[in-house]
């Protein structure tokens, strides 16, 4: 079989400061050196890009500053992290491998990781 | 709205030059890949190159490594073909195509021609 | 590289027939498969992404099944505005291949 299979949790809950972390991991069928993942959210049949990184392998992750996802790698896998989740943001993120270089190119797209997003309950106001 | 733009083609003889342009509205540009797809005559859909996001990466098809040069101009937001050392059976309609979120080719242009011929 | 070979080359049938085109990749590309409509004159549009999933628009008498080698397009009631060339692409990896194409014409 050619295509490359991505491996990602079924479901990962945020924290209560809305940050969510999971797993990405990838069979690579070659020896690649350059990587781009792409984190997609899927909520009501709509699809958006939530951020997407380009690495070497062996070096860290470079998210665009304004990005809300960080992420390391280590071999075939990579430690993604999202921050500032709210209970709106609640929804399915997909994880999209592409091996850039060297050649051949390939392709692979996880299952997704339902992500459960909980607002915090305000602090009740205190008399003391 | 979303969309793609091709222009550039013509009539030209065998063993010259052709550069296409693809002008992309409506979508951030370097978030993409774009591929260049042909359709010759009595034939069916061929995969030409791709150019990835922020364009360090670059495929083509065997029957045009060598002779044609995928680019593309971010600030400008336009793809290009440059189409060398033409031949007869490079004569067709040359579609850009958008590699969507899925990776399929979810947003397609017009078409250009393009006829080489003596 | 992998090949796609779709079944069959052309097909006519009679408005409100249900019509299956098949597609085989000769190596497993899972469901990175799509199908794409060419209508005479007409730019491509897709159809089908990740094998089974109806892209935003398309009218729900198609629809795409199948994973691994074998995949199938079916049009569940054959309309006039079908009459098209349909192609199979697969997309898990470089070059980006297409099927030959099935030529759909109303009887």
């Known amino acids: 079989c050619k295509a490359m299979h991505v491996a990602q949790p079924a479901v990962v809950l945020a924290s209560s400061r809305g940050i969510a972390s999971f797993v990405c991991e990838y069979a690579s069928p070659g020896k690649a050196t350059e990587v781009r993942v792409t984190v997609l959210r899927q909520a009501d049949s709509q699809v958006t890009e939530v951020c997407a990184a380009t690495y070497m392998m062996g070096n860290e992750l470079t998210f665009l500053d304004d990005s809300i996802c960080t992420g390391t790698s280590s071999g075939n896998q990579v430690n993604l992290t999202i921050q500032g989740l709210r209970a709106m943001d609640t929804g399915l993120y997909i994880c999209k491998v592409e091996l850039m270089y060297p050649p051949p190119y390939y392709l692979g797209i996880g299952n997704g990781t339902q992500i459960y997003v909980i607002d915090p309950e305000p602090c009740p106001d205190s008399d003391f | 709205q979303v969309q793609l733009v091709e222009s550039g083609g013509g009539v030209v003889q065998p063993g010259r030059s052709l550069r296409l342009s693809c002008a992309a509205t409506?979508?951030?540009?370097?978030?993409?890949?774009i591929h260049w797809v042909r359709l010759a005559p009595g034939k069916g859909l061929e995969w030409v190159a791709v150019?990835?996001?922020?364009?360090?990466?670059?495929y083509y098809a065997d029957s045009v490594k060598g002779r044609f040069t995928i680019s593309r101009d971010t600030s400008k937001n336009t793809l290009y073909l440059q189409m060398n050392s033409l031949r007869a059976e490079d004569t067709a309609v040359y579609y850009c195509?958008?590699?969507?979120?899925?990776?399929?080719?979810?947003?397609w242009g017009r078409g250009t021609m393009v006829s080489v011929s003596s | 590289d992998i090949q796609m070979t779709q079944s069959p080359s052309s097909l006519s049938a009679s408005v409100g027939d249900r019509v299956t085109i098949t597609c085989r990749a000769s190596q497993g590309i899972s469901n990175y498969l799509a199908w794409y409509q060419q209508k005479p004159g007409k730019v491509p549009k897709l159809l089908i992404y990740?094998?089974?999933t109806l892209q935003s628009g398309v009218p729900s008498r198609f629809s795409g099944s199948g994973s691994g080698t074998d995949f199938t397009l079916t049009i569940s009631s054959l309309q006039p505005e079908d009459v098209a060339t349909y192609y199979c692409?697969?997309?898990?990896?470089?070059?980006?291949?297409f099927g030959q194409g099935t030529k759909v014409e109303i009887k």
């Open positions: 990740a094998a089974s």
């Open positions: 150019i990835w996001y922020d364009g360090s990466n670059r």
């Open positions: 692409q697969e997309y898990s990896s470089a070059p980006w291949t």
């Open positions: 195509a958008r590699a969507g979120l899925w990776s399929a080719f979810d947003i």
């Open positions: 409506g979508f951030n540009f370097s978030s993409y890949g």
